[in-house]
């Protein structure tokens, strides 16, 4: 069921071992194996990149784009197209494209009429024809320095890291990013700014659905959720090379709820999709789809329910804009590639790898406990003859429904390091001549320390304990000594500004809160990082605050029982901005308040003066009581006036009161 976590992998095995007629996970026996490219090939275009960013720099003279291209084998060919839309009938501003490659590449560049400057390494990049653009030699810098080098020339609009691209389309003047500066972050969606096609086609797998008669074939395409959940249309081109009458086929398209499909097929076939779909020939006619399972196993079940006897192609892709499927099966025999790795263990044999993955580690009271549930072992058809630590004299107890192996940190061959206590689980299985081994760990919490670091630049070089409103602050969480087997994650962070300022949520549920908090790529050591920008809309501005973050250490593999949570604090000083009235960022808050309050006073005095004149020029008999003082004309004045003496702060909300 492709469920990612071990208990779920087990759930599938349990389902296959307990074939009750009512199991919805009625395990579909269909052993997906790679299909040769002559039987089926899927290529795609996507905006998803391994690392990237898109920012807006509307007032920059130069539009800067940076591409880091990794080619596993050189030399490679690359087609790079730059597209610009005329703005107000003129070509856009000048463009600097920085091209960083790791091996030789033959570049076919198309940038018609675009005022382009190209920075690249001339020893690695060869043009198929003269580029006809201004070129600059790119220094041999590491990635971070290349970004700095590019940023010195102008604000970076986009940057992306691509692995083995075959073609790239870069759209200029399209940046829709919410960021004001570009910092590479893992797993990004570049939106309309960049689309690319990987050189390697997607892995196509196929299988025979056991127990289904006939020649109906299923083509299953599963599009995985992307990193921006806006509505998307995926164009699916299906080209099946067989005579129209020879084919009985179903196309199953599954994706996140926000994906709709535009189908361009050269054959009539049954269509089964999530979301909505339309056909290239009638693009305006949308047809409602279904809520399909989002697991491979569930989709195979759907194909089986639709009476398909062959899954001619099964493909999982990142969120793509165009997918092309070429297949030549036509309900004939499915041929898979020779001797692929077996993904599903044959029935009635024990899978040692899965068995070892079922061992749960618990750490408490200076002792390590391993638990292995017998029910799961039985479902895997395994017979265990022994479970011990590295020291074979430390044997597990049989506690009825489970085996339990427990030892203090001081015995059974435990290895105690600064950060961890490690040992080895050794399992003897009847069907295997050699014992199975698995490393097991507990964290040495007494020796671990967690630190918060505040920095004033995205390079995280110089630590500080001071933040300035309106200035970006960068935070990094570190654990020392480092623990390679565990992942440090940031669960939540808030800034406590005391009674006047209240609490500002920065991160909640591992997600950024507000439009001026950004989760950044971890440090090379894996330390979580984020940035935030704080604005104060009213006075007084607090002088200090406490940054408080809850972090979790999670095992990179294995049981989640060992998760450890800690809250880390850091006291911060807050410096009030320059009070001289105007800065490059516009009016600072006290100046705004001064002007606003001044306007209010002038308004009030004028009102009083007018009232005085008015009341003294009317006959006494006609005077009326004053019902209300006229409100100041400026809504800012009145709203600011209400909040004098209390502080409002947000992580960069755009609705300024001034």
């Amino acid at each position: 069921m492709d469920r990612g976590t071990l208990p779920l992998a087990v759930a599938l095995l349990l389902a296959s071992c307990s074939l009750s007629p009512t199991s919805l996970a009625e395990t579909v026996h269909c052993d997906l194996q790679p299909v040769g490219p002559e039987r089926g090939e899927v290529t795609y275009t996507t905006s998803q990149v391994s690392k990237g960013c898109v920012a807006q720099a509307p007032n920059a003279i130069l539009e800067v784009h940076v591409l880091f291209l990794e080619f596993p084998t050189g030399p490679s060919q690359l087609e790079l197209t730059l597209q610009a839309s005329k703005q107000n009938g003129t070509w856009p501003r000048e463009v600097l494209l920085v091209l960083s490659v790791n091996s030789s590449v033959f570049l076919h560049l198309q940038a018609l009429g675009i005022p382009l400057h190209l920075a690249y390494n001339s020893s690695l990049v060869t043009f198929q024809e003269p580029p006809g653009v201004n070129t600059t030699e790119l220094p041999s810098f590491p990635k971070t320095q290349i970004l700095e080098w590019a940023a010195e020339r102008g604000p970076i609009t986009s940057a992306a890291e691509l692995n083995d691209p075959q073609s790239i389309l870069l759209r200029l003047g399209q940046a829709q990013g919410s960021l004001s500066f570009c910092m590479l972050e893992a797993s990004q969606d570049m939106g309309r700014t960049l689309e690319w096609r990987p050189r390697t086609p997607a892995l196509v797998r196929g299988c025979h659905l056991e127990g289904v008669a006939g020649h109906k074939e299923a083509h299953i395409l599963r599009v995985l959720p992307g990193h921006s959940a806006g509505p998307r249309t995926v164009t699916v081109k299906v080209e099946l090379s067989c005579a129209p009458g020879d084919l009985d086929a179903v196309l199953i398209l599954q994706g996140p709820p926000y994906v709709s499909w535009l189908i361009d097929a050269n054959h009539n076939m049954q269509i089964w999709t999530t979301g909505e779909y339309s056909f290239k020939i009638f693009p305006e006619k949308n047809i409602r789809g279904f809520k399909l399972p989002d697991t491979p196993q569930g989709l195979l079940g759907e194909a089986r329910m639709l009476n398909a006897s062959i899954v001619a192609s099964f493909v999982e892709l990142p969120l793509a804009s165009i997918v092309s499927l070429h297949a030549s099966s036509c309900g004939g025999r499915l041929q898979t590639s020779p001797a692929p790795i077996q993904t599903t263990p044959p029935k009635d044999t024990c899978s040692p790898e899965l068995l070892m993955s079922l061992i749960q580690t618990k750490c408490a009271d200076d002792a390590m406990t391993l638990v292995l549930k017998k029910e799961l072992v039985a479902h895997l058809k395994c017979t265990i003859t022994g479970l011990t630590f590295w020291d074979p004299s430390c044997e597990a107890e049989d506690r009825g429904d489970k085996f339990v192996l427990r030892s203090a940190y001081s015995s059974c061959g435990m290895q105690v390091s600064a950060s961890m206590i490690s040992n080895e689980a050794v399992v003897n299985i009847l069907s295997s001549s050699s014992p199975q081994r698995k490393k097991v760990h507990c964290l040495n919490m007494d020796s671990l320390s967690f630190q918060l670091g505040l920095y004033l630049s995205p390079h995280f070089l110089q630590a500080s304990n001071t933040i300035e409103p309106g200035q970006q602050s960068f935070v990094q969480v570190r654990v020392s000594p480092s623990v390679s087997e565990f992942l440090l994650q940031l669960d939540s962070c808030h800034l406590d500004l005391g009674p006047e300022g209240g609490t500002v949520e920065l991160i909640q549920g591992r997600a950024a809160k507000g439009n001026c908090v950004s989760l950044l790529s971890p440090s090379p050591e894996g330390d979580p990082r984020f940035s935030f920008l704080l604005h104060f809309y009213t006075v007084p501005i607090p002088k200090t605050g406490t940054l408080s973050c809850t972090v979790a250490l999670r095992p990179k593999t294995g049981s989640q029982d060992q998760e450890v949570h800690r809250t880390v604090f850091m006291r911060l000083n807050i410096i009030s901005p320059d009070l001289s009235g105007c800065t490059s960022k516009g009016l600072v808050l006290p100046a705004v308040l001064g002007i606003t309050f001044g306007a209010f006073l002038i308004g009030a005095l004028l009102t009083a003066a007018l009232w005085y004149i008015y009341s003294h020029t009317r006959s006494p008999s006609k005077r009326e009581p004053v019902v209300a003082v006229a409100a100041p004309a400026s809504s800012e004045s009145s709203s600011t006036n209400h909040s004098i003496g209390s502080t409002q702060s947000t992580p960069c909300s755009t609705s300024s009161m001034a």
Partner: antibody, heavy 120, light 107 residues
Framework: QEQLVESGGGVVQPGRSLRLSCTAS????????IHWVRQAPGKGLEWVTV????????YYADSVKGRFTISRDNSKNTLYLQMNSLRAEDTAVYYC?????????????WGQGTLVTVSS | DIQMTQSPSSLSASVGDRVTITCQAS??????LNWYQQRPGKAPNLLIY???NLETGVPSRFSGSGSGTDFTFTISSLQPEDFARYFC?????????FGGGTRVEIK
């Protein structure tokens, strides 16, 4: 507008039979699996039975197995529930409900229900 | 059968409140979980499917999360029309099973 309308409910004596119908409109009936779910007065929901989109697969709750039979006529866009040997504990509002797809997965559209009272 | 334990069984809240209901499955059901709203005398109405996907036409104040055995349903800001009974339902395995329901009442 997707719609399911149940009919055939009423008062019946224990041990007797009753047949419920469910008529679908506004969607392609033959593409979907359909469930019967019941709710005893003031109680929670209890799944009863399901039939796959083409009628080839049928599943029942243990409490009704052997007594109830689900069937469908795709040409008439109609689902049936034949209830035999009725018991007092079968008293409930019976809803027919559309599955997510061909598969017997979740339920996204429900009828308004028909009340079955089993009483002597 | 998979047991679904829903809590609380009832709660009182005011308009504008944030309301959270939890549902626990007796075994791992991945994300095969729906949340329904049922008003008195009416049929249930699907709000959330696959644990976290908002059904078309359902207001965004409703949300769901969770995977495996623990699931949460949230109404971010309770509206007058939200006072009703809410059910979770698993569809990982037959028989389909429902939580006992949570009645959301006006405080």
């Amino acid at each position: 507008q997707e719609q399911l309308v149940e009919s055939g409910g009423g008062v019946v004596q224990p041990g007797r039979s009753l047949r419920l119908s469910c008529t679908a409109s506004g969607f392609t009936f033959s593409n979907y699996g359909i469930h019967w779910v019941r709710q005893a007065p003031g109680k929670g929901l209890e799944w009863v039975t399901v039939i796959s989109y083409d009628g080839s697969k049928k599943y029942y709750a243990d409490s009704v197995k052997g007594r109830f039979t689900i069937s469908r006529d795709n040409s008439k866009n109609t689902l049936y529930l034949q209830m035999n040997s009725l018991r007092a504990e079968d008293t409930a509002v019976y809803y027919c409900a559309r599955a997510f797809s061909t598969m017997v997965r979740g339920v996204d559209h429900w009828g308004q229900g028909t009340l079955v009272t089993v009483s002597s | 059968d998979i047991q679904m334990t829903q809590s609380p069984s009832s709660l009182s809240a005011s308009v504008g409140d944030r309301v959270t209901i939890t549902c626990q499955a007796s075994q791992d059901i991945y994300k095969s979980l729906n949340w329904y709203q049922q008003r008195p005398g009416k049929a249930p109405n699907l709000l959330i499917y696959d644990a976290s996907n908002l059904e078309t036409g359902v207001p965004s104040r409703f949300s769901g999360s969770g995977s495996g055995t623990d699931f949460t349903f949230t109404i971010s800001s309770l509206q007058p029309e939200d006072f009703a009974r809410y059910f979770c339902q698993q569809y990982d395995n037959l028989p389909l099973t429902f939580g006992g329901g949570t009645r959301v009442e006006i405080k």
